[in-house]
């Protein structure tokens, strides 16, 4: 069987010879050199060599426990002649003993940490950690103690844990923001002869809201023209706050003053300025100066600092409204006028009125924008704004005329304004009714009396208020002895009826019927229209088979006998 115990070896051996580890030995070894000892495993043949005859093991190199604390090797004892193992292969351990050859090393060369300003004494800042590569299970080589080398009286460190805490009351960021603390970690429990390492901790005081906003001046004055539309910026005011970030954010508001309804203040988030803007239209002629009270406040307030006073400040803003020469103002936004279509030239339609709103009340002259009245149908009295016709109108040509009137200050022609005029042309009965289409019909030779051969329709360009009412009749010259009659249907239509039984196309192939159409308006308008009736041969169903076309080719002299 094998005869050995666990081998121990001191690290960092500095002797000139190889370091003796121990002896492998089998009780089968007769000491005659018949056995060969073989070493395999961690570092065999390199770090550890064996005398194959005696089993003595030596370390060839300086060993570092921190690099490798334990080596696991295997031993064989073999009969040199046969190769036959005299013992089972066995595993053994070489354990490296620790010396204090490593200083504590911080996990970071430089730590960065933050803590709120004005923190209570003992507030946690950061924990630093140093590790010592030496053996923590043996002696105090790896027992680390922390101390502060730089950074008192502001900060302290817990010796066992490395926790850094605040040590001074009311540390004010606005006074000093950055601190550099140096911490030492020493092994051997901090005793003499221990190895040490240091780290730097850069501590930044973070801001808290312990400063109110302050206006640098108590009064601001701005000017703005009365023409400034709502939303126009007038000026900027800025309060300063010694804090930073959201603790320095400022909200501006108008709290008082006669301009409370006329102006707004908005906060520019980028610059933290208050922008005074116009809220409602200004009028120099009504009010020339406004006074506002503007307040700057922190939206986020820390209750524990309220004892320092209110976190707001106010300033007075004086706004001077400047006069602006304004264009004339019409009495209406638009005018609607009416005129009959039979109005004579120079007939007055109506009038427009415009006034200079300025205190000067400059006189105004009127004109028609000719781009809107190219045909010069209308004109205006430049002095009093009366609108009149300069040409005859026709409702049936154009019902509405849309023109623009310009009012210009006589003393300052650059100041002008415009207003739309909508002129409606009213209807007059000045058009006679007429046939809706050209009528050409036929009658069968074998037609019976009182047979309807055509229905007549009429149209009228006029547009009477109560609607059209047409009447139809044969012209007086054709009324007696006519071969056809006109029947007025009293619904703005009429029918042509046969008056006898049978027509002979060889005797008379075409009839021309003059029909009088009248309207029912004032003054009555009428016209005469002619209906052509051809006599045709028809089948027994009344369908036309053939007609003479002479009436179309030679219409003269054919109206007689209708």
């Amino acid at each position: 069987s094998w005869m050995w115990n666990q081998f121990f070896l001191l690290e960092e051996y500095t002797g000139s010879d190889y370091q003796y580890v121990g002896k492998l030995h089998s009780d089968q070894d007769r000491g005659d050199g018949s056995l060969k000892y073989i070493l395999s495993g961690d570092g065999a043949g390199d770090l550890f060599i064996i005398n194959e005859n005696t089993g003595d093991i030596q370390a060839t190199k300086r060993l570092d426990r921190e690099e490798k604390p334990v080596y696991i090797l295997r031993a064989q004892a073999i009969n040199r002649r046969t190769g036959r193992p005299v013992e089972p292969e066995s595993e053994f351990i070489i354990k490296i003993h620790d010396i204090n050859d490593n200083e504590p090393i911080f996990t970071k060369e430089v730590y960065t940490a933050t803590v709120p300003e004005m923190s209570d004494v003992g507030t946690f800042v950061v924990q630093v950690t140093a590790t010592d590569a030496d053996d923590p299970t043996y002696g105090n080589s790896a027992k680390v103690v922390y101390s502060i080398l730089q950074g008192q009286p502001y900060f302290s460190v817990e010796s066992e844990t490395g926790i850094i805490k605040t040590a001074l009351l009311n540390m004010d960021r606005e006074n000093r923001e950055q601190y550099q603390v140096v911490i030492q970690a020493k092994d051997m429990g901090g005793q003499m002869g221990g190895l040490s390492g240091t780290t730097t901790v850069n501590i930044t005081l973070t801001d808290v809201n312990d400063n109110p906003p302050r206006f640098p001046q108590s009064t601001y004055q701005f000017k703005t023209p009365e023409s400034s539309p709502p939303g126009t910026p007038i000026g900027r005011i800025k309060a300063s706050d010694a804090d930073v970030g959201e603790n320095a954010e400022i909200e501006y508001s108008i709290t008082d003053g006669e301009g409370l309804d006329m102006f707004d203040v908005i906060t520019d988030q980028e610059t933290q300025e208050g922008i005074i803007t116009v809220k409602k239209l200004l009028d120099f002629e009504k009010k020339k100066v406004y006074t506002l009270k503007v307040e700057a406040s922190n939206p986020y307030v820390e209750p524990r600092f309220l004892y320092l006073g209110p976190f707001k400040d106010s300033a007075t803003v004086r706004i001077v409204v400047e006069d602006v020469d304004e264009p004339p103002v019409f009495s209406k936004l638009a005018y609607i006028l009416q005129i009959r279509e039979d109005a004579q030239i120079n007939t007055t339609i109506g009038s427009v009125t415009a006034q200079d709103p300025d205190a000067a009340r400059n006189p105004v002259k009127y004109s028609v924008d000719r781009h809107t009245d190219m045909d010069r149908i209308f004109n205006i009295d430049s002095g009093n704004g009366s609108i009149f016709t300069s040409k005859l109108l026709d409702r049936e040509t154009l019902l509405w005329h849309n023109i623009t009137v310009i009012a210009t200050e006589i003393n300052n022609p650059k100041q002008s304004s415009r207003v739309p005029l909508y002129i409606k042309v009213l209807d007059v009965n000045d058009n006679a009714p007429e046939f809706a289409e050209f009528y050409e019909t036929f009658v069968c030779e074998k037609a019976k009396a009182d047979q309807l051969i055509q229905t007549l329709h009429a149209v009228d360009k006029d547009d009477p208020y109560s609607g059209h009412q047409f009447s139809f009749s044969l012209a007086p010259e054709a009324a007696s002895g006519s071969n056809f009659t006109i029947q007025d249907n009293k619904d703005n239509t009429a029918g042509i009826l046969t008056r006898k039984n049978g027509y002979n196309r060889h005797e008379m192939s075409t009839y021309l019927l003059p029909v009088v159409i009248s309207d029912n308006d004032y003054p009555v308008q009428s016209s005469t229209g002619t209906v052509t009736v051809r006599v045709c041969a028809c089948d027994h169903h009344g369908n036309m088979q053939s007609c003479h076309a002479e009436a179309l080719i030679h219409p003269t002299g054919l109206s007689t006998g209708a």
Partner: antibody
């Protein structure tokens, strides 16, 4: 470089003896056993015996125990194998071989021994 | 004595083929995880050359296409891809017990 150089071929009469030498170089002669193996024409390998040069301890196969003698001269790093009472069936190539943990890692070039009347 | 039975006694294979030779010992040649079986190559007119020792260990300088395995009584020698220069007779040998004995040999030829 390890080398084993054997003596030259021998022709012997039946009943006589033969002594074959094997000179070693390129290693520590005393640290390794020396073995003798023979091979009859067209036949396989046959182990005859071995010697520990440091103590002259020998082992022989039963077949040759009475006829074979293995010796060494440490001063010249030479091993010898003597076979007596030769017969025709002893005609073979005789090899010396270095032994290391039961294996033959280096061999001599072989010596042909012919037994003929 | 431990008898070594090697098979086949001869074989013919093509270049690139996988060749396997077996050797059976009449009793176990293994102890404490060490297998005292070794393999040799012998070319005509030349002494044998050690290829594999202790059943599976490749001797220094021997090509990796040669390998060995096995334990106790049954052992295998393999050429993974036969090459023309591998034409030879191959022997197994045990050193477990005196007298040390060889297998009868396997002659390997190229088809």
């Amino acid at each position: 470089e390890v080398q084993l150089v054997q003596s030259g071929a021998e022709v012997k009469k039946p009943g006589s003896s033969v002594k074959v030498s094997c000179k070693a170089s390129g290693y520590t002669f005393s640290n390794y056993w020396m073995h003798w193996v023979r091979q009859a024409p067209g036949q396989g390998l046959e182990w005859m015996g071995d010697i520990d040069p440091s103590h002259s301890e020998t082992h022989y196969t039963q077949k040759f125990k009475d006829r074979v003698t293995i010796t060494v001269d440490k001063s010249t790093s030479t091993a010898y194998m003597e076979l007596s009472s030769l017969r025709s069936e002893d005609t073979a190539v005789y090899y010396c071989a270095r032994g290391d943990l039961g294996r033959f890692d280096y061999w001599g070039q072989g010596t042909t021994v012919t037994v003929s009347s | 004595d431990i008898q070594m039975t090697q098979s086949p006694s001869s074989l013919s294979a093509s270049v690139g083929d996988r060749v396997t030779i077996t050797c059976r010992a009449s009793e176990s040649v293994s102890i404490h995880g060490t297998h005292l079986m070794h393999w040799y190559q012998q070319k005509p007119g030349k002494p044998p050359k050690l290829l594999i020792y202790a059943a599976s260990n490749l001797e220094s300088g021997v090509p990796s296409r040669f390998s060995g395995s096995g334990s106790e009584t049954d052992f295998t020698f393999t050429i993974s891809s036969l090459q023309p220069e591998d034409i030879a007779t191959y022997y197994c040998q045990q050193s477990f017990e005196d007298p040390w004995t060889f297998g009868g040999g396997t002659k390997v030829e190229i088809k």
